[in-house]
């Protein structure tokens, strides 16, 4: 058993049929010595008396808010949560496996630049009685500070018969130099509590590996005289690290119709303009990627050919 | 503002072209190592990230773009460090800071060159003959060092008398290649910045 926060404790249980469970001793936070009784949740049934209560925690029915009273007055609470371990593996029931970039990916993180700011998100099908708390650091043995905000519900989607909820959090490394060469990864830890179930999820990464620039901005077309070719120009996104001559981007320019299966014109360039062949009912799209360290491409910025 | 495009122009800035070749060669070699040594811990997640130049050179700080010198976090290890315009120590007189930056890059390359050559000598003794260093990568390191045109003491190649542990050598190769790739990215950024200045 360990303390998650004041008056909230996590009991780690090996979860299998007829498991013996864990013996837990609760102590009432009071100077009083006698006349103390214990109850669980909303029940008025007295579980025991005395300053301490010893219980055998085996299942979710044994978890919950234990309260010690004296003469009708509440003295203190202890909330017990369960953390299940099945076949030596901690449960991951609360969050959905996003399977990208690999299986068992519950947290996904992205950064728009090298400033040390990043966003992580996760998915769940649970809509109520759910809380998250996020901590982060650079390195684990001698951790350096990363400050994270509160996790918020950022999107709701319908997936077949189910509703899916996306939560996200923004974090900022306390003293980040955009030009630094990372040797220790960022660690992100998410505590998830659903009713009386506790789970924790972690992710470890270098900012350089989670870079995904915003799409290029200000796409403009200039038809070339006596030609089917069009000159397309754009600018670096505002959120990208500066100076741009140091943090350079490379671009992919594509002309394609509505369907992915349609024919296309595609060209890669380090410049902020390119010449492509425009077709009726097609769109010109441009996306960006760090020129020197191949992490993710940005989303496309698009303009219609016409 | 519209930034100048970094196109290789050997006359104006020979180092840009060489640094692009360097990053390409290191990336290819790292990819080859990851494929060949698939049953070894050779991915970014599996290895320890060591920097053999730590406390010996200060490339990131010495080559910091002027615009980042206002960032306190970038200056924690040096008072002032920034580069100004100039070419790859070619004909124009370069500033002191710029020379410091380029000489730091040169020292990085020299250290990695010695490490890689020592390692290759060991790998050539491996009866499995599983992996060797790409000669093109070693040549590209050499070309960039020549383009930087510094004279410094020759670092003797390390020779060891004990029987090499090939497993450890291959893991060390992965560690070195990962670190060198990150440094090659920094070098490429620096050269691109200098070329645009």
């Amino acid at each position: 058993i360990w303390e998650l926060k004041k008056d909230v404790y996590v009991v780690e249980l090996d979860w299998y049929p007829d498991a013996p469970g864990e013996m837990v001793v609760l102590t009432c936070d009071t100077p009083e010595e006698d006349g103390i009784t214990w109850t669980l949740d909303q029940s008025s049934e007295v579980l025991g008396s005395g300053k301490t209560l010893t219980i055998q925690v085996k299942e979710f029915g044994d978890a919950g808010q234990y309260t010690c009273h004296k003469g009708g007055e509440v003295l203190s609470h202890s909330l017990l949560l369960l953390h299940k371990k099945e076949d030596g593996i901690w449960s991951t029931d609360i969050l959905k496996d996003q399977k990208e970039p690999k299986n068992k990916t519950f947290l996904r993180c992205e950064a728009k630049n090298y400033s040390g700011r990043f966003t992580c998100w996760w998915l769940t099908t649970i809509s109520t009685d759910l809380t998250f708390s996020v901590k982060s650091s650079r390195g684990s043995s001698d951790p350096q500070g990363v400050t994270c905000g509160a996790a918020t519900l950022s999107a709701e989607r319908v997936r077949g018969d189910n509703k899916e909820y996306e939560y996200s959090v923004e974090c900022q490394e306390d003293s980040a130099c955009p030009a630094a060469e990372e040797s220790l990864p960022i660690e992100v830890m998410v505590d998830a509590v659903h009713k009386l179930k506790y789970e924790n999820y972690t992710s470890s990464f270098f900012i350089r590996d989670i870079i995904k620039p915003d799409p290029p901005k200000n796409l403009q077309l200039k038809p070339l005289k006596n030609s089917r070719q069009v000159e397309v120009s754009w600018e670096y996104p505002d959120t990208w690290s500066t100076p741009h001559s140091y943090f350079s981007l490379t671009f992919c320019v594509q002309v394609q119709g509505k369907s992915k299966r349609e024919k296309k014109d595609r060209v890669f360039t380090d410049k902020t303009s390119a010449t492509v062949i425009c077709r009726k009912n097609a769109s010109i799209s441009v996306r960006a990627q760090d020129r020197y360290y191949s992490s993710s491409w940005s989303e496309w910025a698009s303009v219609p050919c016409s | 503002r519209n930034l100048p495009v970094a196109t290789p122009d050997p006359g104006m800035f020979p180092c840009l072209h060489h640094s692009q070749n360097l990053l390409r060669a290191v990336s290819n070699m790292l990819q080859k190592a990851r494929q060949t040594l698939e049953f070894y811990p050779c991915t970014s997640e599996e290895i320890d990230h060591e920097d053999i130049t730590k406390d010996k050179t200060s490339t990131v700080e010495a080559c910091l773009p002027l615009e980042l010198t206002k960032n306190e976090s970038c200056l924690n290890s040096r008072e002032t460090s920034f580069i100004t315009n100039g070419s790859c120590l070619a004909s124009r007189k370069t500033s002191f800071m710029m020379a410091l930056c380029l000489s730091s890059i040169y020292e990085d390359l020299k250290m990695y060159q010695v490490e890689f050559k020592t390692m290759n000598a060991k790998l050539l003794m491996d009866p499995k003959r599983q992996i060797f260093l790409d000669q093109n990568m070693l040549a590209v390191i050499d070309e960039l060092m020549q383009a930087l045109n510094f004279n410094s003491e020759t670092v003797p190649q390390k020779s060891s008398l004990e029987e090499p542990d090939f497993y450890k050598t291959k893991i060390k190769l992965c560690i070195l290649l990962h670190a060198f790739r990150i440094r090659a990215v920094t070098i490429d950024r620096v050269m691109s910045y200098l070329n645009a200045s």
Epitope: R261, K263, K264, D265, V267, T269, I277, R279, K280 | T7
Partner: antibody, heavy 118, light 107 residues
Framework: QVQLVQSGAEVKKPGSSVKVSCKAS????????LHWVRQAPGQGLEWMGW????????EYAPKFQGRVTITADESTSTAYMELSSLRSEDTAVYYC???????????WGQGTLVTVSS | DIVMTQSPLSLPVTPGEPASISCRAS??????LHWYQQKPGQQPRLLIY???QSISGVPSRFSGSGSGTDFTLTISSLQPEDFATYYC?????????FGQGTKVEIK
């Protein structure tokens, strides 16, 4: 299986014209760009131009501009390349090639040898 | 027009040995570079597109690298069926242009 089948070899006199055909099978004809590339005996490859069979748009290499015409007939899934004012240096194998991507070629015809000789 | 220069023009190689062919562009072309193989009396065949992207059905011993002006086609271990002429082609701008070809022959 996508295939491009070209017309047979031709022998032409200098100053005349030649029209080579390229019939496509497998896949929808208008879903691909179609190019013509030639190769003189013992020489390298030389791009001549492309057509978008969907709308008839064409683009030619400046070297052949005014002498080459590329057309396409959607009803027969056939593309044509006509080269006029032939000279001896036009002796070459002429290939048609296609792709959903405009700028490179993933399927090639077997080639048509055009000999220009007096 | 962008001029593509291949080297060497002829490459004698022992079967089983690796081979590398270089292609240089007269100006920066990013990764807009493709490689073809052509055997005598046959049409060209696409091997690699956009400098390093492999084609399904092409043996994994063929790989491409490079960007900007310098590109390389590598055959890790030459098989008897690999003796052919190899061409690079740029797609950065029209007109599309090819290298002059590199003939890989048995040593």
């Amino acid at each position: 299986q996508v295939q491009l089948v070209q017309s047979g070899a031709e022998v032409k006199k200098p100053g005349s014209s030649v029209k080579v055909s390229c019939k496509a099978s497998g896949g929808t004809f208008s879903d691909y760009y179609l190019h013509w590339v030639r190769q003189a005996p013992g020489q390298g490859l030389e791009w001549m131009g492309w057509i978008d069979p969907e709308n008839g748009d064409t683009e030619y290499a400046p070297k052949f501009q005014g002498r080459v015409t590329i057309t396409a007939d959607e009803s027969t899934s056939t593309a044509y390349m006509e080269l006029s004012s032939l000279r001896s240096e036009d002796t070459a194998v002429y290939y048609c090639a296609r792709n959903k991507e405009l700028r490179y070629f993933d399927v090639w015809g077997q080639g048509t040898l055009v000999t220009v000789s007096s | 027009d962008i001029v593509m220069t291949q080297s060497p023009l002829s490459l004698p190689v022992t079967p089983g040995e690796p081979a590398s062919i270089s292609c240089r562009a007269s100006q920066s072309i990013s990764i807009n570079l493709h490689w073809y193989q052509q055997k005598p009396g046959q049409q060209p065949r696409l091997l690699i597109y956009f400098a390093s992207q492999s084609i399904s059905g092409v043996p994994s011993r063929f790989s491409g690298s490079g960007s900007g002006t310098d590109f390389t086609l590598t055959i890790s271990s030459l098989q008897p069926e690999d003796f052919a002429t190899y061409y690079c082609q740029q797609s950065n701008s029209f007109p599309l242009t090819f290298g002059q070809g590199t003939k890989v022959e048995i040593k």
